[in-house]
């Protein structure tokens, strides 16, 4: 079974002799989720040719996956701690519905998919404690999420495979940008 950061895991940074700071805990947590995404991507790429597909852009247009942009204040250019933190939390909240969609998309990595979902929820809680401007964080409407989930699950097999690939790729990219930004804070 997947191990959460803080427990005994060789996939995350070596344990420190003193307790982890809040920033170190968040860093370790993101890296743990990224390891999980990596395992899920491996299964996805092994079972279909989506990872090399040139039709990505076509499918990507129908998905509204969170993406970092210059205006979000998370890049080195125009870096803004408060704006960036709001973007990271908002983005993670928006990804939750897509992570829910992933739950029935894996056979051998079913537990790993669940671990990524649960760890993301914990990460959001960590980050909300760190954020000063919680009012600026918009939470997606449950009804909107429910209808999006239904729509995604109604796609044909090829589109479902492509959606899975795009969600994992985008989430990985979003988390990596978040990790780089959080290390500046």
């Amino acid at each position: 079974a997947p191990v959460l950061p803080g427990e005994d895991s060789k996939d995350v940074a070596a344990p420190h002799s003193q307790p982890l700071t809040s920033s170190e805990r968040i860093d370790k947590h993101i890296r743990y989720i990224l390891d999980g995404i990596s395992a899920l991507r491996k299964e996805t790429c092994n079972r279909s040719n989506m990872c090399e597909s040139s039709k990505e852009a076509l499918a990507e247009n129908n998905l509204n996956l969170p993406k970092m942009a210059e205006k979000d204040g998370c890049f080195q250019s125009g870096f803004n701690e408060d704006t960036c933190l709001v973007k990271i939390i908002t983005g993670l909240l928006e990804f939750e519905v897509y992570l829910e969609y992933l739950q029935n998309r894996f056979e051998s990595s079913e537990e790993q998919a669940r671990a990524v979902q649960m760890s993301t929820k914990v990460l959001i809680q960590f980050l909300q404690k760190k954020a000063k401007n919680l009012d600026a964080i918009t939470t997606p409407e449950p009804t909107t999420n429910a209808s999006l989930l239904t729509k995604l699950q109604a796609q044909n097999q090829w589109l479902q495979d492509m959606t899975t690939h795009l969600i994992l790729r985008s989430f990985k990219e979003f988390l990596q940008s978040s990790l780089r930004a959080l290390r500046q804070m």
Partner: antibody, heavy 123, light 107 residues
Amino acid sequence: QVQLVESGGGLVQPGGSLRLSCAASGFTFSNYYMTWVRQAPGKGLEWVSSIYSFSGDTAYADSVKGRFTISRDNAKNTLYLQMNSLKSEDTAVYYCTRNLGGVVVTTNGYDYWGQGTQVTVSS
Amino acid sequence: DIQLTQSPSSLSASLGDSVTITCQASQSISDELSWYQQKPGQTPKLLIYGASKLQTGVPSRFSGSGSGTSFTLTISGLEAEDLATYYCLQGYRWPFMFGQGTKVELK
């Protein structure tokens, strides 16, 4: 096999511009972070700039910020470094490097390096 | 900015010796440290990433350790082909930075 081939170096006067290119082959270019590293004659390595895969996120060393621009064309498998307002201290061999990929998702490390292109800034 | 202090700047050793190079970061960089080897007239080569992970194809006499602010590269049993300059790199926080280098020569 993985190959990185730099071009565009040369002799330029202070205040001038150059555009370096790095043609990548043997791997899925769009999936990897790419970085420029330079080495002045008889000196150590200096990290110059990195560009990430899909986000368009870039980062620069303080010594080149505002003068250099890193970019990539994933369709052409090419990395670029636009260098403006060049100074004599920019004289160096410029290496194009690929960041570790595959399952290594967070660790920075440059596993493939081009042969380098010489940039000389002198009047 | 995070500063890296590499020491010593040069060292002389005999073949078969165990050689240790250290890299000190001015603040914690977790395990985001890599080590490179550069021989005269050649391009740098990645030896160690993630502070302690051996890059594929690198001889097992090379090892890395440390986390936080203190890191070590060890060559257990120096060979003639190991005579080179070694650099550490922090990839934790922008701007990323290399150490000043350590030149390993024959005694």
